[in-house]
Every structure is written in structure tokens, then in C-alpha cells.
């Protein structure tokens, strides 16, 4: 720690005297302490002098040595009061600027400690403190206003009894600043804004903040619309309202608008687009494929993007057939609201039934008009299978009919002994059908397809296996030929109930 | 070793507020006085005015009535507003350590500020 | 109008001894102790010489300061050619406001 000669904390002198402060130190050594006048300094190694051979009530303060090397910061210090019968404060500063709830130290130092005893701070032209003013005095540092509020902002004087009459200081201006989180909070409101030409729009930008200091303004691309402002304080919070109101808009308003708020932290703003259209619109749109297809038994849902302005009047789900009469329960129809223009319509459709199929139509409508937008279902089934043995033309015919949806594809297999389904030890034969022969194929139906096998001679310990496949599944049905007659044998693991 | 860094926008609108603020590494901003200075180009340095990190200000008393200083020890930053602004408030602003007899012996490296529209 | 005067410009050749003054008044030079700085262009300035005649460690023992009244100079002995760059004058006034004086372009011929 750095030594101080003469070694006293403080040290009183009269105005005129030379005063001299010598810092000695194991390395070298600053000097700092408040600005004051006829101060030199003089650094010789590993000592420093502070020097004037004109001491003024300027000089009192509190003069600080350390070591800048020093790794734990250690200094040594010592308070010169020059003791001026005509100036008993030294005030340091005309202004003070701390953030609500600091300590607000106001640098009047007193010249003379043994006027200590009748120091007081007041507001200037003598008024009193404010009331709940928590204020401590120290006769080194000056006045403490102890966590400062924004309402103590005011000019202070301090004061001292010199001689049975009051002598005041020069004021010190107290600025509280409001701690600022960060730029002012904005709303521009309607966030989007559609109106048909001629029709009344009104804009409002707002910006709030707890510091009056800000500016706030809108912009219609990029150029500042003059309007009028309006100011309230409420909630601790100072706002500013810009209003803007249309009484028949036309296409030059419309367009982006800014609303803009600035203060010292930084600038805010936010944006919002202005339509204007010739009449009334209704868009109908989805993002799915209008045509779907869904496995029986699952679910799915159908959604409608809607656009318009004016707002909807009227719209419905609406089940078109083939397969029955009913339509969508409305606890499966749910609406939701994206933004002021733009809405999304979903119809749930759990667990599909085969009557479930068909064509499902949106239809909504505002004063615009009237739109549809249809979406087509078809149910995926896996393929059923059942065969026959018949004549055709005098020869002996495995007819093999499957229904399934998509349509689905045959194969024949022929394999040594009687099995419920041939495994590929015992294939002996086996019989691509490319183009089965398309017995139905309505819309939203099932596809049947038949397939024939001619077969000269049924081999009697063997099997004839009919397999169909489509997308979803497979199936298939074991013919067994039995000298009394044919046999045949669905799998066991056909017992699919939709 | 102490370093002093100026931050802020290199354009503001006349009539605005110029705020800047410095950044003190490497040292405490605290129990020193902490200036700043102006220099327009081509031409000679003027003293804005100082802040003790206590919060006590002196300000040069042409921009006194325009000058706002303040301090954040918690951050050790300081900061500079100048309000209602003029092309003639284009300079080079530095923020700088000042010491007892009223010497600076750290400076930040300095930024521009144009005013205009 | 800055409030300390400087010449606007000085030269020398390599070696030479410049001197550059800084008139004041007594409410400035006469009362305080005067610093002195370099600038390079587009750099900020640097302390040369504080409370008169103090060299900051680093700086070279070829810059000296003095103090008279109110006037102050800056000498530089053996001149070289990176001594070349601006170089001001600064003081308080009796308000503890700094004042500069208006910066002197010196030039290594």
C-alpha cells in the first residue's frame, strides 16, 4: 500500500498556503483526486509529488495515491480542507445525474470541518426538501439523497452556519432519470387493414414509455404523415397516440405504414399493410390435394384456407354423397382465425366408415358472393379374395375374383400338397396376371378384378393359391381339388372388418 | 491496460438527440473522472464535459444548456447526450480518462457523427 | 476560436530542435498546469507532456514542456521524421473547464 506524507487523513490549511503531498510507493505511483486549480505534479520513480504554493478553497477534497501495478489495488488517501472564512463549501459539480433508486451524492464539500455541526441541504431560494427526503452528510463527500426519485429532481443548495447567519453554496441541478428498460413499447393497430375504395380506415400508432423523452411518428412508405399527437400518462407510463383517420380511402393509401418510437436506449418500430380494393373478395384455397385418398378405419382432416373482406356471412361443410344422406356433425367442423382477412376451416373425420367416402364441399359466403371448394374421398381397402372352380368353354376354369381399392394385382401359385397357403418350399408353379379383367370400378368404390386359370387337369395333392395386393394389404384363398370335388380355403387371416 | 471504446449511431437527423455512450475495459470506472471531447474535421479538440462515476457533472458552459452526461458503474459504461442538434455538431467524439491536473491520459479511438437529414 | 493560441503550423528538419508555444491568460495557463498532446491523422490523441514539464512512461526524453505565466511551449530535440503530426495545448480555466488551443501541423521538411 502506498504511503502519504504529511501521514494524517486530513489536513487543514488556510487559503494562500503551499501545500505539498508526497506518495510513495514500492513501484510507481498516481495521484487522483477531484478537478481542482494550481495543482503540479511531479512523478520521480516510485514517488509522486502534488504541489501548490496557492492553496484555495478550490483544493479541498479528497486526494487519492495508488499503485497501478498494485494486483490488489491497495491506496492510501488524505482530505485537505482549506479553510476560506468566506467560502465554507467546495462544490464540485453543477449537475448530478443518477437512475431512480441510486444513492444522489451532491458534491458540496465543506472547506471548514468544524462547521459540521450546523450543515442542513435545502432547495434553492431557501425552500424545504421535499417530504420523505432521506438525506445523510458527510463532511468529505457532501450531501446523500438515499435512493433518489424521479420527483426529487430539483436544484439543491447546501447550507452552513457560519457566525450565526446561513451561508448557501452554489446550486447543484439533481436528475433522476428513470431507469429506461430499453426503446418505448409500440402498438400500430390493425396489424393488416383492408378496406374497398371509398370506405372509412382509421390507423392509430402508439407508443408508451416510464420517461416522457421519446418521439414517436408514422410513416405511409417511408414518408412522416404530419398528424396530430396526443398525450396521457397512465400506469407510470407516458403515451403518445397518433391517429389517423380516412373517410373514403382510394389506392393512394394504400400501402405500408410504420409506426416509429424513439429514445435514447434505441428505436422501436413496427409495420403493418394497407389494401385497397376495388369491391369484395372471397378466396377459397387449401394446401392439401383436393383429391385424397385415406385407408379405411383412419382418420383425416380437411382444411380450408379462406380469404375475404368483408368479413363471412355464412359458411358449411356439406356432404355431397354417393354413399348415404348424412352430413358432417358440426362438433367435427372447427374454425379458426389466423388474422382479420384470412381464416382456416378443418373437418375432422376419424376413424372413416366405408358410407364415409365421397365427395365433401366448403361453401362460404359474404357479400361478395358465394364460393365452393370441393375435396374428393376415396377409401383404400385391402384386396378380398375368393375363388371358384367352373367350366369355361368345356375346360376346366379357377376363376379368382379380388375387390380391393387401389386396384389390386394377381398372382397365381401352384404348390405340392394341400396347404392353407403355399410357402415357397413347396411352389411348383407360379402365374403373373397382368391384366386382370376389371369387373367394377365405380368412383369411390372398390375395384373388382377376376382372373382365370385355365387348368387342363386338377392335380389332386396339390394346391392352387390365388393372391391379390394392392398398397395397403394382401390377401388370398387356397383352392384344394378333392376327388369327391373342389375344396375351398380362405386364410386364416382373413377376417378383416372394416 | 484501461481501454475506452465510443458506441452510438454515425447518423443522426437535425434537431434529434445525439446519444453515445463509452465503454471502460481492462480498469473500475470508478473513483476516476471520466471526459468527452469533440473534434469536427480539419479542425482543433473541444472539451464537452466530465462525469465522476458518482454521477456529478461539469459541463462546457457553450453546450451546457444541450449536454446530458450519466453513468452505469454496474456497467462500467458512461454516456454522452446532446440534444437538439446541427450540422455544426459534426465531429469525431472521444471519451477519455481525465486526471488531477487535467490531463487525459486514456482515449477511446473515437466516432463519427454526421448530422443530417 | 479556440481559447489557447498555437501557431497553425511548425517545421524542421531531421535533428533540428522545434519549439511550438501555447499562449494563455491568467485564468487558464496562469493559474493551472498545462498538458500537451500528439495526434496522427485519423487516430486519436495521445498524452505527451502533463502539469507542465511530466513525460507519461514511453513517451521519449526529446519532448520537453515548460511553463512561464501565461504561455507554455513544447520542444522536440532531434527532430525525426514520425514526429510529424498535430500537436495541442490544454489547460482549465478557473472553472475547471478544458480548454485546447487551436492544434499546430508540424512538418519534418
Known amino acids: 500500500i502506498p504511503v502519504i506524507e504529511p501521514s494524517v487523513p486530513e489536513l487543514v490549511v488556510k487559503p494562500g498556503a503551499t501545500v505539498t503531498l508526497r506518495c510513495v510507493g514500492n513501484g510507481s505511483v498516481e495521484w487522483d483526486g477531484p478537478p481542482s486549480p494550481h495543482w503540479t505534479l511531479y512523478s520521480d520513480g516510485s514517488s509522486s509529488i502534488l504541489s501548490t504554493n496557492n492553496a484555495t478553497f478550490q483544493n479541498t477534497g479528497t486526494y487519492r495515491c495508488t499503485e497501478p501495478g498494485d494486483p490488489l489495488g491497495g491506496s492510501a488517501a488524505i482530505h485537505l480542507y482549506v479553510k476560506d472564512p468566506a467560502r465554507p463549501w467546495n462544490v464540485l459539480a453543477q449537475e448530478v445525474v443518477v437512475f431512480e433508486d441510486q444513492d444522489a451524492l451532491l458534491p458540496c464539500l465543506l472547506t471548514d470541518p468544524v462547521l459540521e455541526a450546523g450543515v442542513s441541504l435545502v432547495r434553492v431560494r431557501g425552500r424545504p426538501l421535499m417530504r420523505h427526503t432521506n438525506y445523510s452528510f458527510s463532511p468529505w463527500h457532501g450531501f446523500t439523497i438515499h435512493r433518489a426519485k424521479f420527483i426529487q429532481s430539483q436544484d439543491y443548495q447546501c447550507s452552513a452556519l457560519m457566525g450565526g447567519r446561513k451561508v448557501m453554496s452554489i446550486s447543484i441541478r439533481l436528475k433522476v432519470q428513470k431507469v429506461i428498460p430499453g426503446p418505448p413499447a409500440l402498438t400500430l393497430v390493425p396489424a393488416e387493414l383492408v378496406r374497398i375504395r371509398g370506405e372509412a380506415a382509421q390507423i392509430v400508432c402508439s407508443a408508451s414509455s416510464v420517461d416522457v423523452n421519446f418521439d414517436v411518428f408514422l410513416q405511409h412508405n417511408n414518408t412522416k404523415l404530419a398528424i396530430p399527437q396526443q398525450s396521457d400518462f397512465h400506469n407510470n407510463r407516458y403515451q403518445k397516440v397518433l391517429t389517423l383517420n380516412l373517410d373514403q380511402v382510394d389506392f393512394q393509401h394504400a400501402g405500408n405504414y410504420s409506426c416509429v418510437a424513439s429514445n435514447v436506449q434505441g428505436k422501436h418500430s413496427t409495420s403493418m399493410f394497407f389494401r385497397v380494393v376495388e369491391s369484395a373478395y372471397l378466396n377459397l384455397s387449401s394446401e392439401q390435394n383436393l383429391i385424397q385418398e385415406v385407408t379405411v378405419g383412419e382418420g383425416l382432416n380437411l382444411k380450408v384456407m379462406v380469404e375475404a373482406y368483408p368479413g363471412l356471412q355464412g359458411f358449411n361443410w356439406t356432404y355431397l354423397g354417393p354413399f348415404s344422406d348424412h352430413q358432417p356433425e358440426p362438433k367435427l367442423a372447427n374454425a379458426t382465425t389466423k388474422d382479420t382477412y384470412r381464416h382456416t376451416f378443418t373437418l375432422s373425420l376419424p376413424r372413416l366408415k366405408p358410407s364415409e367416402a365421397g365427395r365433401y364441399s366448403f361453401l362460404a359466403r359474404n357479400p361478395g358472393g358465394w364460393r365452393a371448394l370441393t375435396f374428393e374421398l376415396t377409401l383404400r381397402y385391402p384386396p378380398e379374395v375368393s375363388v371358384i372352380w367352373t367350366f369355361i368353354n368345356g375346360s376346366g376354369t379357377l376363376l379368382c375374383a379380388a375387390s380391393g381399392y387401389p386396384q389390386p394385382n394377381v398372382t397365381w401359385l401352384q404348390c405340392s400338397g394341400h396347404t392353407d397357403r403355399c410357402d415357397e418350399a413347396q411352389v411348383l408353379q407360379v402365374w403373373d396376371d397382368p391384366y386382370p379383367e376389371v369387373l367394377s370400378q365405380e368412383p369411390f368404390h372398390k375395384v373388382t378384378v377376376q382372373s382365370l386359370l385355365t387348368v387342363e387337369t386338377l392335380e389332386h395333392n396339390q394346391t392352387y393359391e390365388c393372391r391379390a395386393h394392392n398398397s395397403v394389404g394382401s390377401g388370398s384363398w387356397a383352392f384344394i381339388p378333392i376327388s369327391a370335388g373342389a375344396h375351398t380355403h380362405p386364410p386364416d387371416e382373413f377376417l378383416f372388418t372394416p | 491496460q484501461v481501454q475506452l471504446q465510443e458506441s452510438g449511431p454515425g447518423l443522426v437527423k437535425p434537431s434529434e438527440t445525439l446519444s453515445l455512450t463509452c465503454t471502460v475495459s481492462g480498469g473500475s470506472i470508478s473513483s476516476y473522472y471520466w471526459s468527452w471531447i469533440r473534434q469536427p474535421a480539419g479542425k482543433g479538440l473541444e472539451w464537452i464535459g466530465r462525469?465522476?462515476?458518482?454521477?456529478?457533472?461539469n459541463y462546457n458552459p457553450s453546450l451546457k444548456s444541450r449536454v446530458t452526461m450519466s453513468v452505469e458503474t454496474s456497467k462500467n459504461q458512461f454516456s454522452l447526450n446532446l440534444s437538439s442538434v446541427t450540422a455544426a455538431d459534426t465531429a469525431v467524439y472521444y471519451c477519455?480518462?481525465?486526471?488531477?491536473?487535467?490531463?487525459?491520459?486514456?482515449w477511446g479511438q473515437g466516432t463519427l457523427v454526421t448530422v443530417s437529414s | 476560436q479556440s481559447v489557447l493560441t498555437q501557431p497553425p503550423s511548425a517545421s524542421g528538419t531531421p535533428g533540428q530542435r522545434v519549439t511550438i508555444s501555447c499562449s494563455g491568460s491568467?485564468?487558464?495557463?496562469?493559474?493551472?498546469?498545462v498538458n500537451w498532446y500528439q495526434q496522427f491523422p485519423g487516430t486519436a490523441p495521445k498524452l505527451l507532456i502533463y502539469s507542465n514539464n511530466q513525460r507519461p512512461s514511453g513517451v521519449p526524453d526529446r519532448f520537453s514542456g515548460s511553463k512561464s505565466g501565461t504561455s507554455a511551449s513544447l520542444a522536440i530535440s532531434g527532430l525525426q521524421s514520425e514526429d510529424e503530426a498535430d500537436y495541442y495545448c490544454a489547460a482549465w480555466d478557473d472553472s475547471l473547464n478544458g480548454v485546447f488551443g487551436g492544434g499546430t501541423k508540424l512538418t519534418v521538411l
Open positions: 491568467s485564468s487558464n495557463i496562469g493559474s493551472n498546469t
Open positions: 462525469i465522476y462515476s458518482s454521477g456529478t457533472t
Open positions: 477519455a480518462r481525465e486526471r488531477i491536473t487535467g490531463h487525459f491520459d486514456y
